[in-house]
Amino acid sequence: TMAIWRSNSGSNTLENGYFLSRNKENHSQPTQSSLEDSVTPTKAVKTTGVLSSPCPPNWIIYEKSCYLFSMSLNSWDGSKRQCWQLGSNLLKIDSSNELGFIVKQVSSQPDNSFWIGLSRPQTEVPWLWEDGSTFSSNLFQIRTTATQENPSPNCVWIHVSVIYDQLCSVPSYSICEKKFSM
């Protein structure tokens, strides 16, 4: 069974630390007006003027997941726990379509970086998604920020269209993802 969330939020301003999307009758509008192409949800039915969706209010729906772009600054670990408290996980990118969707969202905020659910214990050990699955560089490359002064960037964030490693303790925004089952 699928949980249906009903929301009549019409805001796309910063509210409660989250970047909100404007709910429309048949689609979720991306978070900035510069993003013209809307994303069509798999299930979103208009009932009595209120959007019914498998996502909680203010989350963005794309294919079979709900996404929350958190605008509160936190370390990677703090961001992970923040997502957990919301019944979700840091973003796991499963496909090139999903990557394109995410890039489109974050490109509207060129000053900000967003933690995703990829980390490693140290440079000798491979990257690992938060759910324990392997990372394949076929999907995207991770651009390193390592320097002599900062040799251990063991967490990953996305900035505009580029994915970087970064020190896990650096405060940043984050993307939570909640997969739903039909």
């Epitope: 214990p121 050990v125 759910d131 324990g132 392997t134």
Partner: antibody, heavy 118, light 107 residues
């Protein structure tokens, strides 16, 4: 649900080889590392290595280098552990385990007892 | 290689007791530590990963804490099914390694 089912018990002579299988179901086999862990009778757990079922890449504990081989057959979602030049102190239960968050082992096979005796 | 030690090696306790097991790494491993429970003749069962995250389906009486080199597993109120051997495991560097185990038995 996630399940790992291992092959049955084996009795081998010193110097022989053994090949243990681990069949996965309930998830996408190529998405998660498979680890092998052994446990000698009355002893603790010992990590032997892992295989990435997607790429076939392996990482073996130095202790076993030269006589351990991990392989997989993605068409039947099965991982294999082969240990050669067996000695009596290789007598143990061998477990396969699926990787989970933070490189923990969230799902385990039932174990395969390998007895090495002349 | 990173060595893991556990203390005590065994502990006798009663149902309802609070039990704490300590695990120490020979060098810092951040939070890359897991805890397992094993009963005789059975495969280990994951309890805690990432030093403090409770595995799905594990009762909330189990908790983990620590970072760096010193970690603890706490059972807040021991239940009959909790009598078992507990292992810690570092996942910071190869080879991954387990502690020697702590046996919790009935007093």
């Amino acid at each position: 649900q996630v399940q790992l089912v291992q092959s049955g018990a084996e009795v081998k002579k010193p110097g022989a080889s053994v090949k243990v299988s681990c069949k996965s179901s309930g998830y996408t086999f190529t998405d998660y590392y498979i680890h092998w862990v052994r446990q000698a009778p009355g002893q603790g757990l010992e990590w032997m290595g892992w295989i990435n079922p997607n790429s076939g890449d392996t990482n073996y504990a130095q202790k076993f280098q030269g006589r351990i081989t991990m392989t997989r057959d993605t068409s039947i979602s099965t991982a294999y552990l082969e240990l050669s030049r067996l000695r009596s102190d290789d007598t143990a239960v061998f477990y396969c385990a699926r990787n989970s968050g933070s490189y923990s082992f969230g799902y385990w096979g039932q174990g395969t007892l390998v007895t090495v005796s002349s | 290689d990173i060595q893991m030690t556990q203390s005590p090696s065994s502990v006798s306790a009663s149902v309802g007791d609070r039990v704490t097991i300590t695990c120490r790494a020979s060098q810092g491993i951040s939070s890359w530590l897991a805890w397992y429970q094993q009963k005789p003749g059975k495969a280990p069962k994951l309890l805690i990963f990432g030093a403090s995250s409770l595995q799905s389906g594990v009762p909330s009486r189990f908790s983990g804490s620590g970072s760096g080199t010193d970690f603890t597993l706490t059972v807040s109120s021991l239940q009959p099914e909790d009598f078992a051997t507990y292992y810690c495991q570092q996942a910071y560097s190869f080879p991954f390694a387990f502690g020697p185990g702590t046996k919790v038995d009935i007093e």
